[in-house]
């Protein structure tokens, strides 16, 4: 029961995971522009996302434009976009392959099979997290950097937008439910009995594979 | 309008010492980030050192650390490179440069000092 | 450090040409690249900054652009004013360099 538990709280985690890196990657709030400077009278705030960036006056009014070429855009937004889409795809082939071996379903009934395809769904979880991470470590790397580039005009300069917060919280998130759902599949042999047990029992044991001695370096 | 306007250069023995000075006017000088930039004759222009606003960071090529020094006096909205342990390659008009709001790099020039360093 | 080949060394070109100064940065310095333009016996003026953002009060027939790591600065309509020694600089970490310039001359 621990290990059902432990299941249900892993893909829990990713969904939440999921949700929060679909947000982080549709949302213009990566990097947040502030213009308050001596001779400009009315304040305004620049967000730029992924997808499109919005201008918010003082008075509240909001003006969002989508980017126009895909070509004509800078090679790291190209590549931000690229991961944040790949990454959202693999979490939800993570879920596919869970639902595949989860312990309610009957997809597949052999508990090692059911074992394994929970492991690889651990594992394409955790990947993307890691997918999820990589553009918004960049982008606030280069936040960062340019917040301490004495070259760069401070109307040049970006804070960190809520999409990155979000989008840490996402692979956070997808790290850590990946991880509970790995842990939760030690060995097959290892699991206590379970009401798929009396269907084999007359069946010769099955020889099954720890973890370790899976071919994992396909999911790395 | 902006005026940078450097002066104390001058002909120096190698190993000797100068400092430049940068008088700023037309805007408020605490507020943005000045640099030095020098160029030897019939050379490329060359970084030598930065201070942001407010002098809390400096920053130096390694060609210069540990022999200039850049410092600003807000009060008398100056900035200034004090040059030690001056040599041959040190020879250039060395130029006061003012950052910019909206614009990055170099945005405001002086008309620079010649230093020449000779025996 | 990063290194800044600029080319051609010198130009000659006529009233009216189309004329174009290209930097090479030995790695990446993203968009983070500035032209300056010396003009005989006067201080550098900045044209453009952020590799393709030209500054307010430069005439419109100076253009940048980037490609990778290979920049450059365009002149539409060369003008005879425009004779001058172009740099170009880096500033995406320090030390900030700069090329070795192009002198543009006119035919």
């Known amino acids: 029961m621990a290990s059902a538990g432990m299941q249900i709280l892993g893909v829990v985690l990713t969904l939440l995971g999921w949700v929060n890196g679909l947000v982080s990657c549709a949302l213009p709030m990566w990097k947040v522009t502030a213009f308050i400077g001596n001779s400009i009278v009315v304040a305004q705030v620049v967000w730029e996302g992924l997808w499109m960036s919005c201008v918010v006056q003082s008075t509240g009014q909001m003006q969002c434009k989508v980017y126009d070429s895909l070509l004509a855009l800078p090679q790291d937004l190209q590549a931000a976009r690229a991961l944040c889409v790949i990454a959202l795809l693999v979490a939800l082939f993570g879920l596919l392959v869970y639902l595949a071996g989860a312990k309610c379903t009957t997809c597949v009934e052999e508990k090692d099979s059911k074992a394994r395809l929970v492991l690889t769904s651990g594992i394409v979880f955790v990947i993307s997290g890691v997918l999820t991470l990589i553009p918004v470590c960049w982008t606030a790397h280069a936040i960062i950097r340019d917040f301490y580039n004495p070259l760069v005009a401070e109307a040049q300069k970006r804070e960190l937008g809520a999409s990155l917060y979000l989008g840490w919280a996402a692979s956070g998130l997808l790290l850590l439910g990946g991880g509970l759902l790995c842990c939760t599949c030690p060995s097959g042999g290892s699991q206590g009995p379970s009401h798929y047990m009396a269907r084999y029992s007359t069946s010769a044991p099955a020889i099954s594979r720890g973890p370790s001695e899976y071919p994992t370096k396909n999911y790395v | 309008e902006v005026q940078l306007v450097e002066s104390g250069g001058g002909l120096v023995k190698p190993g000797g010492s100068l400092r430049l000075s940068c008088a700023a006017s037309g805007f408020t000088f605490n507020d943005y980030t000045m640099s030095w930039v020098r160029q030897a004759p019939g050379k490329r222009l060359e970084w030598v050192v930065t201070i942001s606003s407010g002098g809390g960071r400096t920053y130096y090529p390694d060609s210069v650390k540990g022999r200039f020094t850049i410092s600003r006096d807000e009060a008398k909205n100056s900035l200034y490179l004090q040059m030690n342990s001056l040599r041959a390659e040190d020879t250039a008009v060395y130029y006061c440069?003012?950052?910019?709001?909206?614009?990055?790099?170099?945005?405001?020039w002086g008309q620079g000092t010649l230093v020449t360093v000779s025996s | 450090d990063i290194q800044m080949t600029q080319s051609p060394s010198s130009l000659s070109a006529s009233v009216g040409d189309r004329v174009t100064i290209t930097c090479r940065a030995s790695e990446n310095i993203d968009s983070y690249l500035a032209w300056y333009q010396q003009k005989p016996g006067k201080s550098p003026q900045l044209l453009v900054y952020?590799?393709?953002l030209l500054v307010d009060g430069v005439p419109s027939r100076f253009s940048g652009s980037r490609s990778g790591t290979q920049f450059s600065l365009t002149i539409s309509s060369l003008q005879p004013e425009d004779v001058a020694r172009y740099y170009c600089q880096h500033y995406y970490s320090i030390p900030y360099t700069f090329g070795s310039g192009t002198k543009l001359e006119i035919k």
């Open positions: 440069i003012r950052g910019d709001y909206r614009y990055d790099a170099f945005a405001y």
């Open positions: 952020a590799s393709t």
